[in-house]
């Protein structure tokens, strides 16, 4: 269940997809990845206020309990709901190879 | 890939399964759930230091970028990796019914 997409904190403040430009050095990949040398990393960033993009029943429970016990139970967290695959050219013992990673770039976000 | 299970912050401080006792009132379910009247809610709580229980490549990237840009990129977050089903007896228009929810109780945790 994908609950409310209206952010009560103001535009762009709630859980959504952001793009962060990163070099292979930034990612700690310079020793094994050859290409791309720059990655447009998409990730899920933002607040998860009550019922905003609640991923499931667990997220709804978490919201309720966080309201009751904020020091014990954290608010739901903005995480990927799905991913875009990405191809990397990487070093191998014998040369180079192309490898597709299915869990690298966030495609869509929700709160859990 | 499930990375290190050793918590550098001390025992019990890192991402793990916690149980929180909650009444139907706490959960806001009193008007539609009849049983159980008290739920042992299992949820994922705790810090996600570098590579601790990293769910996938995305989590590893997030750790690297959080280290570089802590004000822009949040640390990975402790969320359910899987769930335990739970049966609720709930009110219906015609009486009561048993309903199994597959996404209610966290079974296992990871960082993402």
């Amino acid at each position: 269940a994908r609950n409310g997409d209206h952010c009560p904190l103001g535009p762009g403040r709630c859980c959504r997809l952001h793009t962060v430009r990163a070099s292979l050095e930034d990612l700690g990949w310079a020793d094994w990845v050859l290409s791309p040398r720059e990655v447009q990393v998409t990730m899920c960033i933002g607040a998860c206020p009550s019922q905003f993009r609640a991923a499931n029943m667990h997220a709804q429970i978490k919201t309720s309990l966080h309201r009751l016990k904020p020091d014990t139970v954290p608010a739901p967290c903005c995480v990927p709901a799905s991913y875009n695959p990405m191809v990397l050219i990487q070093k191998t013992d014998t040369g180079v190879s192309l490898q597709t990673y299915d869990d690298l770039l966030a495609k869509d976000c929700h709160c859990i | 890939a499930r990375n290190g299970d050793h918590c550098p912050l001390g025992p019990g401080r890192c991402c793990r399964l916690h149980t929180v006792r909650a009444s139907l009132e706490d959960l806001g379910w009193a008007d539609w759930v009849l049983s159980p009247r008290e739920v042992q809610v299992t949820m994922c709580i705790g810090a996600c230091p570098s590579q601790f229980r990293a769910a996938n490549m995305h989590a590893q990237i997030k750790t690297s970028l959080h280290r570089l840009k802590p004000d822009t990129v949040p640390a990975p977050c402790c969320v359910p990796a899987s769930y335990n089903p739970m049966v609720l007896i709930q009110k219906t228009d015609t009486g009561v019914s048993l309903q199994t929810y597959d996404d209610l109780l966290a079974k296992d945790c990871h960082c993402i």
Epitope: T19, L34, R37, E38, Q40, T42, N84, V87, I89, L105 | -
Partner: antibody
Framework: QVQLVQSGAEVKKPGSSVKVSCKAS????????ISWVRQAPGQGLEWMGG????????SYAQKFQGRVTITADESTSTAYMELSSLRSEDTAVYYC????????????WGRGTLVTVSS | DIVMTQSPLSLPVTPGEPASISCRSS???????????LDWYLQKPGQSPQLLIY???NRASGVPDRFSGSGSGTDFTLKISRVEAEDVGVYYC?????????FGGGTKVEIK
């Protein structure tokens, strides 16, 4: 089978603009970069610029800066190249190509769109 | 911009014989990771270009092993060990060490 399908041939007047499209069908679009390369009749290949569809960030060759705009629509898996203030020297076949950032590796090319600029 | 210079301009070949094309760059294409960011493309008559070699010496998927790329820094060579009739077309080298990407002028390979 992934393909890059380009829009049809265009005939344009000098001074006008043209917008060529490139649609990725049958595969992932977002995690590759799309570059635009042109080829004037009987000439070689010339890189115009490219875009990361996932972020919408574009990069252009200095020669075309201010005259070319490259955009992408993730929802339709389509990239666009718009060239303005057309002159006869812009008569060429315009190709889109899929690559890994700007590191080359253009492993997939569209069939090309012929743009003729003539008064 | 990096200038790419190819020679010869035209290369008449006999089927079954070897062929060699040279490509020179005005700046080094050797990146700090020890790899050369140079591709070779073949454009067959009436067709779009196709990738033959990437990162200086790596054959693209489906490319016959009679094609090989070599060289480093500013001097590169594409070799065809035994030319076949289907190899006719224009061969281009392209540098990808930096933007703007630039192509060589092309070498037209034709059967004698």
């Amino acid at each position: 089978q992934v393909q890059l399908v380009q829009s049809g041939a265009e005939v344009k007047k000098p001074g006008s603009s043209v917008k060529v499209s490139c649609k990725a069908s049958g595969g992932t679009f977002s995690s590759y970069y799309i570059s635009w390369v042109r080829q004037a009749p009987g000439q070689g290949l010339e890189w115009m610029g490219g875009i990361a569809p996932i972020s919408g960030t574009a990069s252009y060759a200095q020669k075309f800066q201010g005259r070319v705009t490259i955009t992408a629509d993730e929802s339709t898996s389509t990239a666009y190249m718009e060239l303005s203030s057309l002159r006869s020297e812009d008569t060429a076949v315009y190709y889109c190509a899929r690559g890994l950032a700007y590191d080359g590796y253009f492993d997939l090319w569209g069939r090309g769109t012929l743009v003729t600029v003539s008064s | 911009d990096i200038v790419m210079t190819q020679s010869p301009l035209s290369l008449p070949v006999t089927p079954g014989e070897p062929a060699s094309i040279s490509c020179r760059s005005s700046q080094s294409l050797l990146y700090s990771n020890g790899y050369n960011y140079l591709d070779w493309y073949l454009q067959k008559p009436g067709q779009s270009p196709q990738l033959l070699i990437y990162l200086g010496s790596n054959r693209a998927s489906g490319v016959p092993d009679r094609f090989s790329g070599s060289g480093s820094g500013t001097d590169f060579t594409l070799k065809i060990s035994r030319v076949e009739a289907e190899d006719v077309g224009v061969y281009y080298c392209m540098q990808a060490i930096g933007v703007p990407l630039t192509f060589g002028g092309g070498t037209k390979v034709e059967i004698k």
